[in-house]
Structures are given as structure tokens and as C-alpha cells.
């Protein structure tokens, strides 16, 4: 996890999320996502 402090003093937290492709289809491997402020953006 990481934390970024902006000039405004507002802190934005981001967290790496790992999902398995197998859960949503027949592919193998991991899918990496990024959650920023509670929203998955990647």
C-alpha cells in the first residue's frame, strides 16, 4: 500500500488487488488491479 500527500493535505490511498483470470473465464494467471480511494481503476 502507498500513501500520497498532496498540497491540499488530502491523502489518497492506493492498494494493489490481485484477481485470478480463472474466476471469470478459462484463462490462467493473475490480473492485477489498482484501487484508489475505494475505486478500482486498473
Amino acid at each position: 500500500d502507498a500513501e500520497f500527500r498532496h498540497d491540499s493535505g488530502y491523502e489518497v490511498h492506493h492498494q494493489k488487488l490481485v484477481f485470478f483470470a480463472e474466476d471469470v473465464g478459462s484463462n490462467k494467471g493473475a490480473i492485477i488491479g489498482l484501487m484508489v480511494g475505494g475505486v478500482v481503476i486498473a
Epitope: Q15, K16, L17, V18, F19, F20, A21, E22, D23, V24, K28, G29, A30, G33
Partner: nanobody, 124 residues
Framework: EVQLVESGGGLVQPGGSLRLSCAAS????????MGWFRQAPGKEREFVAT????????YYADSVKGRFTISRDNAKNAVYMQMNSLKPEDTAVYYC?????????????????WGQGTQVTVSS
């Protein structure tokens, strides 16, 4: 949910190996992605490794990649973790956990069922 019981922990010297086992009860074991987490004294529980329902895919924390290997045997309702080249910083209580389909498999709160943990101590 499944009930999980870990075993195989112990005291080992740096550079040594251990094999952890996790026995699951219940007929639904094969529908869960399974993971190993660890918690050192005074620290948060952290992700170590995870494996898909079929065993076809795995994912590891960077800190254990190349040293630890997760596997499972759905016929035996069991998950294993082979731990090689152990370091003092690997000392922790290790937990086996079961995650629902579609969960983020590196996040402890995404797991529904947990074992009681097994202590691993790496020290000379």
C-alpha cells in the same frame, strides 16, 4: 464455508526448509481459491501465496517468490506450502485461508474461512 487446520510449522535454522499443510473439511473445498498469509508479532497479517481452485495458477508475494511454492490436492482436500531458503524475517504465524470466487486474493478481508495458524520460527 470450510474448516481449515494447518500443520507443519516449527523451528528451523536460516537456510532450512519446512512444508506446511492445510487440511480442509467439507465437500466444497474445490470451489475455493486458497491462500497462505502470515502474521509476525506486532505486524499486520500479510499475504504470502495463493492458488486457484483448479491449481492451475498461483501468485506469490515478492518477498517469497522463488523460495516458497504453493500447491493443492483437491482429492485430499489439502493445500501445501513448501518453504525453502528460510530467513529470520519469515518468522511468523502462518494461516491458511479460503477465498470466494472473484475475491481479490491478496487481501485478507476477502477470505471467508481461516485456520488457527501454525508457528514458523527461523532462528539459529
Amino acid at each position: 464455508e470450510v474448516q481449515l487446520v494447518e500443520s507443519g510449522g516449527g523451528l528451523v535454522q536460516p537456510g532450512g526448509s519446512l512444508r506446511l499443510s492445510c487440511a480442509a473439511s467439507g465437500r466444497t473445498f474445490s470451489i475455493y481459491n486458497m491462500g497462505w498469509f502470515r502474521q509476525a508479532p506486532g505486524k499486520e497479517r500479510e499475504f504470502v501465496a495463493t492458488i486457484t481452485r483448479s491449481g492451475g495458477s498461483t501468485y506469490y508475494a515478492d518477498s517469497v517468490k522463488g523460495r516458497f511454492t504453493i500447491s493443492r490436492d483437491n482429492a485430499k482436500n489439502a493445500v501445501y506450502m513448501q518453504m525453502n531458503s528460510l530467513k529470520p524475517e519469515d518468522t511468523a504465524v502462518y494461516y491458511c485461508a479460503a477465498a470466494r470466487i472473484g475475491a481479490a486474493v491478496n487481501i485478507p478481508s476477502e477470505y471467508d474461512s481461516w485456520g488457527q495458524g501454525t508457528q514458523v520460527t527461523v532462528s539459529s
